[in-house]
Every structure is written in structure tokens, then in C-alpha cells.
């Protein structure tokens, strides 16, 4: 994302198709209050940012309200009247969906169905990752809606789960961000647990009849 005009690195994140965050890192201007000027596609005049992000007392970014906008953001980062970085970007390329909300687990024998509230826009993947203390790495399953069924689980094992949302690359391109993970929740025998033991508990001895 970051062009290196006059040593300025930028990052754009479009939070949940609601708010655009543009941040900059300009070592040459580290003690300067750079200003951010922008317009959306089709608008004539540039507006100045009204919601700056500050780092060590100096401007380091801007937050813009941009509800479900599928167009180009034109912006200029300036030192006084002098532009130090000017660019235009398709905002949706930098989509970061919000973290899954209202995550629920429905158990039936050796399977669990994980559901959450679908976001209001489409072309997303809802990914569930899970593991037991016996697993060396996370297992993953994803679906187009937040209704993911994982089968073949061992009812005796404790499993940790978390969920996130990703934008489909074919639709939004390769530069999007996955959502933050939901909180980890732990389950064993269909019941929620505070945590899964880090070291696997040895299997119970089978009682001979």
C-alpha cells in the first residue's frame, strides 16, 4: 500500500465498510503535524480531516466516515501547503470486516455447528479454527455464511475454537485484511470450559467387564 513519496509510508484500512483509517509513517516529518486532505470520487473540493489520530502528540492518521462506499478515495498528506504524499485508492480493496458477533455452538454427538450473526454485506468467508491439546496446529473450516459444521470430533477431548471473517479475494482483491479473531472458547463433552489443559490428560483406563 505504502508509496515512498518523500519517505512517507501509508496504510489504509476500511473497517467493516463503515470507517476508513489512513495512517502514515513519515520519519522526515516525525515531529510535524501533517494535515490530511481528501475527497471521494466525484466530489470537487478537498476536505480536511476532522478526526485525526495522534502519536506522541503529532498527527499520524485520519478516520473518515465512509458508509458502504464503493469508490475511490483521493487524498493528500501535507506539510503546511506542501503535499508530501498524494494518492488515490479504491477503498474496498482494504476492507477489514468486523469480528464475528453472537458466536454460538450447537453440539450433536461428534459434531458441532458454529453460528454467528452474518454481516450486512456479502462475498465473505466465515472461518472457524479449532484444536485440542493433542493437535500440533489449528484445524480450519470455512463457509460462505456463519454456519459452519465440524464433524469427526472426539467427545472426550477438549477443543478450543475461534472464528473470524475474511473477504473473498475474487471479489475484493488480495489486499484485504481478515477480521480480528473472536474470543477463544473451550468445549468438552458439549460443555463450555474455562480452558483446555495445555498438556493432554492421559486417556482413562478402560475397565474390563
Amino acid at each position: 500500500q505504502g508509496g515512498a513519496a518523500e519517505g512517507v509510508q501509508i496504510q489504509i484500512i476500511y473497517f467493516n465498510l463503515e470507517t476508513v483509517q489512513v495512517t502514515w509513517n513519515a520519519s522526515k516529518y516525525s515531529r510535524t503535524n501533517l494535515t490530511f486532505h481528501y475527497r471521494f470520487n466525484g466530489d470537487e473540493a478537498y476536505d480536511q480531516c476532522t478526526n485525526y489520530l495522534l502519536q506522541e502528540g503529532h498527527t499520524s492518521g485520519c478516520l473518515l466516515d465512509a458508509e458502504q462506499r464503493d469508490d475511490i478515495l483521493y487524498f493528500s498528506i501535507r506539510n503546511g501547503t506542501h503535499p508530501v504524499f498524494t494518492a488515490s485508492r479504491w477503498m474496498v480493496y482494504y476492507l477489514k470486516p468486523s469480528s464475528p458477533k453472537h458466536v454460538r455452538f450447537s453440539w450433536h454427538q461428534d459434531a458441532v455447528t458454529v453460528t454467528c450473526s452474518d454481516l450486512s454485506y456479502g462475498d465473505l468467508l466465515y472461518e472457524v479454527q479449532y484444536r485440542s491439546p493433542f493437535d500440533t496446529e489449528w484445524q480450519s473450516k470455512q463457509e460462505n455464511t456463519c454456519n459452519v459444521t465440524i464433524e469427526g470430533l472426539d467427545a472426550e477431548k477438549c477443543y478450543s475454537f475461534w472464528v473470524r471473517v475474511k473477504a473473498m479475494e475474487d471479489v475484493y482483491g488480495p489486499d484485504t485484511y481478515p477480521s480480528d479473531w473472536s474470543e477463544v472458547t473451550c468445549w468438552q463433552r458439549g460443555e463450555i470450559r474455562d480452558a483446555c489443559a495445555e498438556t493432554p490428560t492421559p486417556p482413562k483406563p478402560k475397565l474390563s467387564k
Epitope: 500500500q1 505504502g2 508509496g3 515512498a4 513519496a5 464503493d70 475511490i72 494518492a87 488515490s88 485508492r89 479504491w90 474496498v92 480493496y93 462475498d123 473473498m168 475474487d170 471479489v171 475484493y172 482483491g173 488480495p174 489486499d175
Partner: antibody, heavy 119, light 106 residues
């Protein structure tokens, strides 16, 4: 089979306007953006803008904002581009093309419409 | 405006040769770079998307590489149907194309 069928060649006088059509078939018209591209010997390929057939929302290349107008007719699955205040510099081949999602690369193109501006 | 510079302007080759075409962006465009082939009196056809991703129905002799500002389209063993113009397109900002590379018969 996906097809974008464009209207035929146009010979138009300077200062007039012209409207070029692009009829889509073989796919859901409202599910893909329609873009317009100008090809001339002077400047190779130039993106003019795009329209969302679902809601008619347009985005233009700033260089063409006052030169072209994009519209659609959903009932006939047809996109239109009107080019205004024609000069000899507008003489070119104009293509419509479609893209899926927000990614803006073109997987299908029309056959092109040749526009000649001459008195 | 992001300017795309293609080189060489013309490439003269014999069928069976392998070639590389260059596209350089005036600023970083991540992987938002796509390649098209246009035969004489025809419409362009998409070859590669996002720098390196293949397109269904496009022969495997076409491949793409690069990221940021420097991109390459490679054709492994050129066939006669490959002659024509090759254009790169960036979609990072409002869309622009390179001036093209003409691949011609030596």
C-alpha cells in the same frame, strides 16, 4: 455463452454527441460492473469509467468526467455511453467490458465500436 | 495517476522462442496488475490477474510474476497465435494501462 454486443460504427460531426450501446447476454447483467475503455493510436488504452447495472452508480476517470455519461437499461440488459462535444481527439475504438466484484480487471470485452469524428 | 511503462516497445521473435515482457509502475501497486493480449482487429483478452494468477482457458505457457512496481509476463515457447499487442493494467488506483508491447514475427 457470455457476450457483450456493441452497436455499429459511427461517423459524427464535431461538437455533436453520440450514444454507443453494449448489450449483455449469457450472464446476470446486474451481477457485474460494466466498464468503458477508449483505444486510440495516440494514447493506447484509456479507462473511461464504470457503471453498476444494479443501481446505476457510476465512477469516472477524472479525465473523462465531462466527456462521457454512462447509463444502463436493466430491462434490456444494455449499457450505454454517451460522448459529448465531440472533437477529432474523440475518434477511437470504444470497448465495453465487464468485471466481477470490486477487482476491476476485465474478463469479457465487447467487439468494439469505431467512432470517427469528422466534418 | 499511476503510469505503467512497458518494455520493450517491440519484440521480434521466432515461434518456439521464450520471451519476457516488462511492466513497471510509477509507484507501488501491490499485486493489482493484470495482463491482456490483443490480436490485430480483435478485443483484448485477459491472460493473468493480480500479477501472477492464471486465468481459466489461457494456455499454461503464459505466466506472470512480480509485485510492487516491477512485473513480468513470460511466454514459454511462443506460438504463432501469440503475436499481437500485450498490455498491462493496474487497478490499485483509477485504472490505467501501459502503452503496450508488440510481439511480432522475426
Amino acid at each position: 455463452e457470455v457476450q457483450l454486443q456493441q452497436s455499429g460504427p459511427e461517423l459524427v460531426k464535431p461538437r455533436a454527441s453520440v450514444k454507443i450501446s453494449c448489450k449483455a447476454s449469457g450472464y446476470s447483467f446486474t451481477g457485474y460492473y460494466i466498464h468503458w475503455v477508449k483505444q486510440s493510436h495516440v494514447k493506447s488504452l484509456e479507462w473511461i469509467g464504470r457503471i453498476n447495472p444494479y443501481n446505476g452508480a457510476t465512477i469516472y476517470n477524472p479525465n473523462f468526467k465531462d466527456k462521457a455519461s454512462l447509463t444502463v437499461d436493466k430491462s434490456s440488459s444494455t449499457a450505454f455511453m454517451e460522448v459529448h462535444s465531440l472533437t477529432s481527439e474523440d475518434s477511437a475504438v470504444y470497448y465495453c467490458a465487464r468485471s466481477y466484484g470490486y477487482v476491476n480487471y476485465f474478463d469479457y470485452w465487447g467487439q468494439g465500436t469505431t467512432l470517427t469524428v469528422s466534418s | 495517476e499511476i503510469v505503467l511503462t512497458q518494455s520493450p516497445a517491440t519484440l521480434s521473435v521466432t515461434p518456439g522462442d521464450s520471451v519476457s515482457l516488462s511492466c513497471r509502475a510509477s509507484q507501488s501497486i501491490s499485486n493489482n496488475l493484470h495482463w491482456y493480449h490483443q490480436k490485430s482487429h480483435e478485443s483484448p483478452r485477459l491472460l493473468i490477474k493480480f500479477g501472477f494468477q492464471s486465468i481459466s482457458g489461457i494456455p499454461s505457457r503464459f505466466s506472470g510474476s512480480g509485485s510492487g512496481t516491477d512485473f513480468t509476463l513470460s511466454i514459454n515457447s511462443v506460438e504463432t497465435e501469440d503475436f499481437g499487442m500485450y498490455f498491462c493494467q493496474q487497478t490499485n488506483s483509477w485504472l490505467t494501462f501501459g502503452a503496450g508491447t508488440k510481439l511480432e514475427l522475426k
